[in-house]
């Protein structure tokens, strides 16, 4: 018997579509071999109609396709606009039609149900609204208008113009009679239920002169849309439920084993703790549509999701819904990166952010997830240089190491920095990832003066002590600006006394500014890195004042003041609009903070070429 498997019989009606899924053993040979859908003729030959190599026969042109899913060992043949001529015997298979692996499929296309002449067909999703149009003649204008539902041989009154409403339709149906001259009345049914499905009859007047019109109402429960996303990646559910529920509370829920639906997030402020730090419900548009983004996808996120609208913020029968089936692919293209990064108060973290390597030119962003209400993620930094004012001097986004990873460094950590952060770009939204920063007990490894006042025209020497464990790392000093951190020349000065229990490899790296200029004022970072991986950083603020006493100035930790908690920016610097992320396309609207410090110029502070390429990594 053939190892290929599929539906033995497929039946449908004219004008409809079918989707035929065929399964095959997913060996490497099978995954890459030709897939086909062919029709068996009287001669026994099987004529190809569509294949995975792009062939589509003339009578399938524009209405059929074949998609291979090698990771699942399936391929799907979609055929639209079916006609009765499509009825027949087919094969789905692999390899060559005549001697490959195949499965026989019988397709039967029928005319569809016989409906009374002139019947209007209304096809509407459950929970939505239908408007049934009922024409009448002038002589029936003053007479009673009514809508009946045909159940078997009987007709049950649903609504009429004498204010009768069938209890099954209470509070969700209305009959509208237009002004004079318009010979049509309408019946509007809201929040359609599956039980509303069936044949209806409009009637105006009575006796032999009455006007009648048949309406076939087909109420469909939306079948789940299939969504395949990668482990560790991101999924966006776009939910458009219609204007009728634009002002009603919205929700996303996940169907559980009891067939009820657990709220994942809603607009009333409810959120499932399993999605803490990795979910946003983006504000709805005027048309009532909204979207939910979930990042850091896990295998256990798989399942059926429904979005809907109801004043309670949860699923209720007869209200509109949309459905998705989420599959999380474990063979992910998104590389593993730490989901939790730990730092100590006063210390730093370096976070690795993956992005689609095909989109190296995309803008990169980092935002802070906030859980209030529907969740939001105000941007903190972006690759073009925008940095939130309160992060000045302690946050930088680096393009390195490149090739699918960028790095974000945050230093001068406080307990307030603990939380969830998102890495994202203005490109492939599926590569949004989440990292949690935790502040733990401990001391920073790098020691720099708290803050420094330099004298104009003199020499300034800033020491940075590092422990022996960093002896093999590359050390650097850089001058921070909101567009990055420009590397400066620095020198190793041998052993340091800052670490008592350390061998001779404990060292000091210092930065010398000679002579100090006004442009030198600003934030400086001392850091370590190893190949592609950035390690810890420490920041020091240098203020420049007028010359008072001649001579050079050497700053040691003993003389240093405490680091300022926050530098007050010039009043001319505009604050960044604290805008939550909704769509990366909106990022361009962010206001950019003016550069608070020019890069030090001249030969005094040339860029250390060894540090511009091989960077990246994460310090835990």
């Amino acid at each position: 018997k053939s190892p290929v498997f599929g539906p033995q019989e497929v039946s449908s009606v004219e004008g409809n579509s079918v989707s035929i899924k065929c399964y095959y053993p997913p060996t490497s040979v099978n995954r890459h071999t030709r897939k086909y859908w062919c029709r068996k003729g009287a001669s026994g030959r099987c004529i190809t109609l569509v294949s995975s190599e792009g062939y589509v026969s003339s009578n399938y042109a524009g209405r059929a396709n074949l998609t291979n899913f090698p990771e699942n060992g399936t391929f799907v043949v979609n055929i639209a606009q079916l006609s009765r001529d499509d009825s027949g015997h087919y094969k789905c298979g692999l390899g060559i039609n005549s001697r490959g692996l195949s499965f026989d499929v019988s397709l039967e296309v029928s005319q569809g149900p016989e409906l009374p002449n002139g019947t209007e067909v209304y096809t509407v999703d459950v929970g939505r609204t239908v408007t049934i149009k009922c024409p009448f003649k002038t002589e029936n204008a003053p007479k009673t208008k009514a809508l009946y539902k045909k159940i078997g041989q009987t007709s049950v009154l649903v609504i009429d113009s004498r204010n009768y409403v069938n209890p099954n339709y209470k509070d969700r149906i209305r009959l509208r009679i237009p002004g004079t001259g318009q010979l049509i009345f309408t019946v509007v049914i809201d929040r359609l239920r599956l039980s509303d499905h069936g044949l209806y009859l409009c009637q105006a007047g009575d006796g032999s002169n009455r006007d009648e019109k048949n309406a076939d109402l087909q109420v469909l429960e939306p079948e789940p849309e299939l969504v395949y996303e990668d482990l560790r990646g991101s999924v966006t559910f776009h939910c458009a439920l219609g204007l009728e529920v634009a002002n009603v509370a919205k929700f996303l829920c996940r169907v559980n084993s009891r067939e009820t639906c657990d709220v994942v997030i809603n607009t009333l402020g409810k959120r499932d703790s399993a999605f803490e730090g990795r979910i946003l419900l983006n504000p709805q548009d005027k048309d009532g549509s909204f979207s939910v983004v979930i990042t850091g996808l896990r295998k256990e996120d798989e399942g059926r999701y429904l979005c809907g609208a109801h004043s309670d913020g949860q699923l209720q029968e007869g209200w509109p819904i949309q459905a998705w089936q989420l599959f999380v692919n474990e063979e992910s293209t998104i590389p593993r990166s730490p989901t939790v990064v730990k730092g100590v108060a006063g210390g730093s973290v370096a976070v690795l952010c993956p992005y689609n390597p095909k989109e190296s030119q995309s803008l990169k962003y980092w935002c802070l997830w906030e859980g209030a209400q529907n969740g939001r993620c105000p941007l903190l930094v972006e690759s073009q240089g925008l940095v939130q004012e309160q992060y000045e001097g302690r946050l930088s986004l680096l393009q390195e190491p490149g090739n699918g990873t960028f790095t974000v460094i945050l230093n001068q950590l406080t307990t307030q920095d603990a939380g969830f952060y998102w890495c994202l770009t203005n490109g492939d939204t599926r590569w949004r990832t989440t990292v949690e920063i935790k502040i733990i007990e401990g001391e920073p490894n790098l020691k720099v003066p708290g803050n420094v006042t330099a004298v104009l025209g003199e020499t300034l020497n800033i020491p940075c002590h590092f422990p022996c464990k960093f002896s093999s790392y590359e050390k650097y000093w850089c001058k921070w600006s909101n567009t990055g951190c420009q590397t400066l020349p620095s020198q190793d000065e041998g052993p340091s006394e800052a670490f008592v229990n350390c061998d001779e490899n404990s060292r000091l790296v210092s930065l010398t500014l000679n002579p100090v200029t006004r442009a030198d004022e600003g934030w400086y970072w001392c850091g370590v890195k190893q190949g592609h991986f950035y390690g810890e950083t420490a920041a020091v603020y240098v203020a420049v004042e007028e010359k008072k006493v001649a001579g050079s100035r050497y700053v040691s930790p003993a003389k240093a003041d405490a680091a300022p908690d926050e530098k007050v920016l010039d009043s001319g610097v505009r604050e960044i609009e604290n805008k939550a992320i909704q769509d990366p396309r909106l990022f361009a609207e962010e206001k950019v903070v003016a550069d608070t410090g020019d890069q030090a110029g001249g030969s005094r502070a040339s860029v250390d070429s060894s540090s511009s390429e091989e960077q990246g990594g994460s310090s835990k």
Partner: nanobody
Framework: QVQLVESGGGLVQTGGSLRLSCAAS????????VGWFRQAPGKEREFVAA??????????YAADSVKGRFTISRDNAENTVYLQMNSLKPEDTAVYYC????????????????????WGQGTLVTVSS
Amino acid sequence: QVQLVESGGGLVQTGGSLRLSCAASGRTFSVYRVGWFRQAPGKEREFVAAVIWSGASTYKYAADSVKGRFTISRDNAENTVYLQMNSLKPEDTAVYYCAADPLGLPGPDVRVEGGYRHWGQGTLVTVSS
């Protein structure tokens, strides 16, 4: 919760016929797929037949061992799925289980037990020689 109740099992002679019924009740969501599985004494549960419906289209599946002998069908109005079993053989002796799931075409392989969220208690079919 969706409840599934099987009926129609019994004792039949080789070559005889039986019709099994699977009635669904209490469903919160529409069921889009129903499968029949069987478990013979001392053996693992195996796939027999399944039906998926999507809009106006219906897809029927059958295991090689029952092709041409067993037919699956459904009665929409009654919320019932039937398994018509003809030309029965002693090797068809087993407890027959009905399974259902709200996931239709997008769902997993119909032959996989994990593709069904709801199961009935089973009905015994004995084919004597």
